[in-house]
């Protein structure tokens, strides 16, 4: 009976949509790389489903993912980073769907951090600085950053600035006086590697001075 049940499960499984997406993070933990995959349909029953990557690996032909709630995850040094790997969704030994992917084309950088804003009274501007772990990496060193800021009362009116450095100057006259602003930053690979935007950094909140205010450095909130 269990044999019939398993066959039935498999037949049902073949009717489902097992579309999935993945992103890689290179040198995310020392020299270790990671690969994260998830189903695009959140309602997929993942009980018996596994992910496997084969090809373009060092010292092994295939690796199995670990399941962490709704996501599937590998952390390893064994990505060759040359050529395409075959990533498959499997039930037992049967592959339900596969994708051939070059892991260097699905890179998601780590989120920037240490975002801060300093007001320069003499220059009448704001210096935005942040940090990224990618400055120390061997592979994904060159990033494009997207700094987004908005007046706190304007729910969806974000202003975006793209830059390749980790420092940005905002002119005081471009901002509203005596207003509270929220600012955040994210990154995407910009040289050789391809992929996706990182998560946003934690937001930083700052208040612009009154028009004739001479307070010097602004206070973060």
């Amino acid at each position: 009976e269990s044999g019939y049940a398993q066959n039935g499960d498999l037949e049902d499984a073949e009717l489902d949509d097992y579309s999935f997406s993945c992103y890689s993070q290179l040198e995310v933990n020392g020299s270790q790389h990671s690969l994260t995959c998830a189903f695009e349909d959140p309602d997929v029953n993942i009980t018996n489903l596994e992910f496997e990557i084969c090809g373009a690996l060092v010292e092994v032909k295939c690796l199995n993912f670990r399941k962490l709630q709704e996501i599937y995850f590998i952390e390893t040094k064994k990505f060759l980073l040359i050529g395409k790997s075959n990533i498959c969704v499997k039930v037992g030994e049967k592959s339900l769907t596969c994708k051939k992917i070059d892991l260097t084309t699905i890179v998601k950088p780590e989120a920037p951090f240490d975002l801060s804003v300093v007001y320069r009274e003499g220059a009448n501007d704001f210096v935005v600085t942040f940090n990224t772990s990618h400055l120390q990496k061997k592979y994904v060193k060159v990033l494009m950053h997207d700094v987004a800021y908005r007046q706190e009362k304007d729910e969806n009116k974000w202003t975006h600035v793209n830059l390749s450095s980790t420092k940005l100057t905002l002119l005081q006259r471009k901002l509203q006086p005596a207003a509270m602003y929220e600012i955040k930053v994210r990154s995407i690979p910009d040289h050789y590697f391809k992929g996706f935007w990182s998560e946003w950094s934690p937001s930083y909140y700052f208040r612009t001075p009154e028009i004739n205010n001479s307070s010097g450095e602004m206070d973060p909130i």
Partner: antibody, heavy 117, light 110 residues
Framework: EVQLVESGGGLVKPGGSLRLSCAAS????????MHWVRQAPGKGLEWVSL????????YYADSVKGRFTISRDNAKNSLYLQMNSLRAEDTAVYYC??????????WGQGTLVTVSS | NFMLTQPHSVSESPGKTVTISCTRS????????VQWYQQRPGSSPTTVIY?????PSGVPDRFSGSIDSSSNSASLTISGLKTEDEADYYC?????????FGGGTKLTVL
């Protein structure tokens, strides 16, 4: 139809230089890892070098490291091998090969490099 | 670095079956996929087996590949030999970012 056409081979004196080219067509070149493999007269295949789809990753056999440079121009669908400080033992037919989903499913016809005084 | 060792030559009659071995000197044969190439005289190499036992389209099913962990070797088997199979055959494996070729085996169809 996939085509790889090597050129640039010829006779060169020891210590001299040559630049080999490989013109690719019939596939998505900028999605493919590319290799150079050589074969000395009457001998077996010897891997020389590879370059990733983007040009970032380049690797070389110990026998050519520091003398040969692999590069690519994705806009021109072309692969190159700059060979400096050539030696007699570099005499061989040089093939470019497309890795695709598995190494060597497509090879060029080869270009002969002869190093002799 | 490891080496891949093949017999220098093998010969067999048309219609028969021949097996060419490829033995890895150190490290496991299972650690990366094996490919096999056929090179006819005066021609470029072509892939006959990839990923240990997979045949590219257009390669007849007379060609098969296998791995034997106990002998740390790979094998290419050609059944129903034809005169057109006369060629040099090379095995290949990745070694990190390098490719390692076997020395080649000359197959003569008598």
């Amino acid at each position: 139809e996939v085509q790889l056409v090597e050129s640039g081979g010829g006779l060169v004196k020891p210590g001299g230089s040559l630049r080999l080219s490989c013109a690719a067509s019939g596939f998505t070149f900028d999605d493919s890892v590319m290799h150079w493999v050589r074969q000395a007269p009457g001998k077996g295949l010897e891997w020389v070098s590879l370059v990733g789809w983007d040009g970032f990753f380049t690797y070389y056999a110990d026998s050519v490291k520091g003398r040969f440079t692999i590069s690519r121009d994705n806009a021109k669908n072309s692969l190159y091998l700059q060979m400096n400080s050539l030696r007699a033992e570099d005499t061989a037919v040089y093939y470019c090969a497309r890795q695709g989903d598995y190494m060597g499913n497509n090879w060029g016809q080869g270009t002969l490099v002869t190093v002799s005084s | 670095n490891f080496m891949l060792t093949q017999p220098h030559s093998v010969s067999e009659s048309p219609g028969k079956t021949v097996t060419i071995s490829c033995t890895r000197s150190s490290g496991s044969i299972d650690s990366s996929y094996v490919q096999w190439y056929q090179q006819r005289p005066g021609s470029s190499p072509t892939t006959v087996i990839y990923e240990d036992d997979q045949r590219p389209s257009g390669v007849p099913d007379r060609f098969s590949g296998s791995i034997d962990s106990s002998s740390n070797s790979a094998s290419l088997t050609i059944s129903g030999l034809k005169t057109e199979d006369e060629a040099d055959y090379y095995c290949m494996q990745y070694d990190f970012h390098h490719l390692v070729f076997g020395g080649g085996t000359k197959l003569t169809v008598l």
